[in-house]
Interface confidence: medium
């Protein structure tokens, strides 16, 4: 079987939420059973199409309604021919969208006026991703390349911080971290606390 992908480049870039149809052309077989594979695993999709072009030329379609990050990867199609599995050239599907947070600022409890750090990291594609920091409704830092660490010299009351990630597709806002004041035991002084409270909280990838 002469197997080739047609109508799609080797690298395909699609925006998150958009549909995509991958095509696979099979020549030299009368009744190919075309299966799509993503990163080594057969793709289950009940609506895969076979279109006969001629007796020995078929096109298989794989239709994705709304791509998300988890759809990104390497796709190819395969057919069995005389006990042998023939595979096509792959298509690399890249899914672009607004930045996705891998690290967001974490709630903290710190003594009054004690320095602390908050961390924020977001990824594309597309890259680069830049980070802007907010204290309440006031922009206090950035834009800076992701990942970004915000060094705060101290707070005297409970304060809210968040970060914003920007790329060519738009922006995403992180969770809001609340930095609470820690009660300081009597007889000790807040400015003796010079250790940093580091935040590197990460959450699992959300499905759309």
């Amino acid at each position: 079987a002469g197997l080739k992908l047609m109508g799609a480049p080797v690298k395909l870039t699609v925006s998150q939420g958009q549909p995509v149809k991958l095509n696979c052309s099979v020549e030299g077989m009368e009744e190919p059973d075309i299966q799509w594979v993503k990163d080594g695993a057969v793709v289950q999709n009940l609506d895969q199409l076979y279109i006969p072009v001629s007796e020995q030329h078929w096109i298989g379609f794989l239709s994705l309604k709304s791509v998300e990050r988890s759809d990104a990867g390497r796709y190819w199609c395969q057919v069995e021919d005389g006990g042998e599995t023939e595979i096509s050239q792959p298509v690399w599907l890249t899914v672009e969208g607004v930045p996705f947070f891998t690290v967001e600022p974490k709630d903290l409890a710190v003594p009054p006026n004690a320095p602390f750090q908050l961390s924020c990291e977001a990824v594309g594609p597309p890259e680069p991703v830049t980070i802007v920091w907010w204290r309440g409704t006031t922009k206090i830092g950035g834009p800076a390349p992701s990942p970004s660490v915000l060094n705060v010299t101290g707070v005297t009351q409970s304060t809210m911080f968040s970060c914003e990630a920007h790329n060519l597709k738009g922006l995403a806002s992180s969770r809001t971290a609340t930095v609470h004041l820690q009660l300081v035991p009597r007889g000790s002084s807040a400015h003796h606390h010079h250790h940093h409270h580091h935040s590197a909280w990460s959450h699992p990838q959300f499905e759309k």
């Epitope: 059973d33 009940l46 609506d47 199409l49 076979y50 239709s63 309604k65 998300e68 069995e80």
Partner: antibody
Framework: EVQLVQSGADVKKPGASLTISCQAS????????ISWVRQKPGKGLEWMGQ????????NYGPSFQGHVTISADRSTATAYLQWRSLEASDTAMYYC??????????????????WGPGTLVTVSS | SYELTQPPSVSVSPGQTARITCSGD??????AYWYQQKSGQAPVLVIY???KRASGIPERFSGSSSGTMATLTISGAQVEDEADYYC???????????FGGGTKLTVL
Amino acid sequence: EVQLVQSGADVKKPGASLTISCQASGYTFTDYWISWVRQKPGKGLEWMGQIVPRASRTNYGPSFQGHVTISADRSTATAYLQWRSLEASDTAMYYCVRPYFQTSGGTIPEYYQHWGPGTLVTVSS
Amino acid sequence: SYELTQPPSVSVSPGQTARITCSGDALPKKYAYWYQQKSGQAPVLVIYEDEKRASGIPERFSGSSSGTMATLTISGAQVEDEADYYCYSQERNGNYAVFGGGTKLTVL
């Protein structure tokens, strides 16, 4: 002209085995998969499963996995739905369904469907 | 197992717009299809891939999908549109398909 001809109505006792058929004509049988759909009296449609005739690859709905078997005979262009042991709750109309796609000059295909007329299966003691 | 949820019934007067909804967690990722079934007949495909009208279906039928909700709209419903309507889609991984419970449309 595309046709899906289903076997006639059948009455069986609980515990009996049964195979109903769906014979396709007017197109190349192996080009498209065939699905089976159940409709109990006065109730809604239920997707049972499907078969890709060219490879005899099957998918089943969770409620039907292990209770029915879908198969196909390429030589007679016929799809089958089989029970080893019928229950009263299997009383229903069973439809076979064939999707198909047509292209205009090789562009994105347009989707069509053919439904068989249905086979009424009654399971009663 | 995966479910698609539809309202059991919708009633409109002739000429009014009827909207039938179908909700399912996988609908952001999987296409919705709509079927019409009149009493004693086999179902007929009305809408495929969320919004494409099937061959021979009047223009007053349209489909849309947003998030976890698909909607079949009949603009200017006719008495002959009285039927049961079913949505159909796949579970998220594409291993099997399901129908919604069906909606009885009454055009009074």
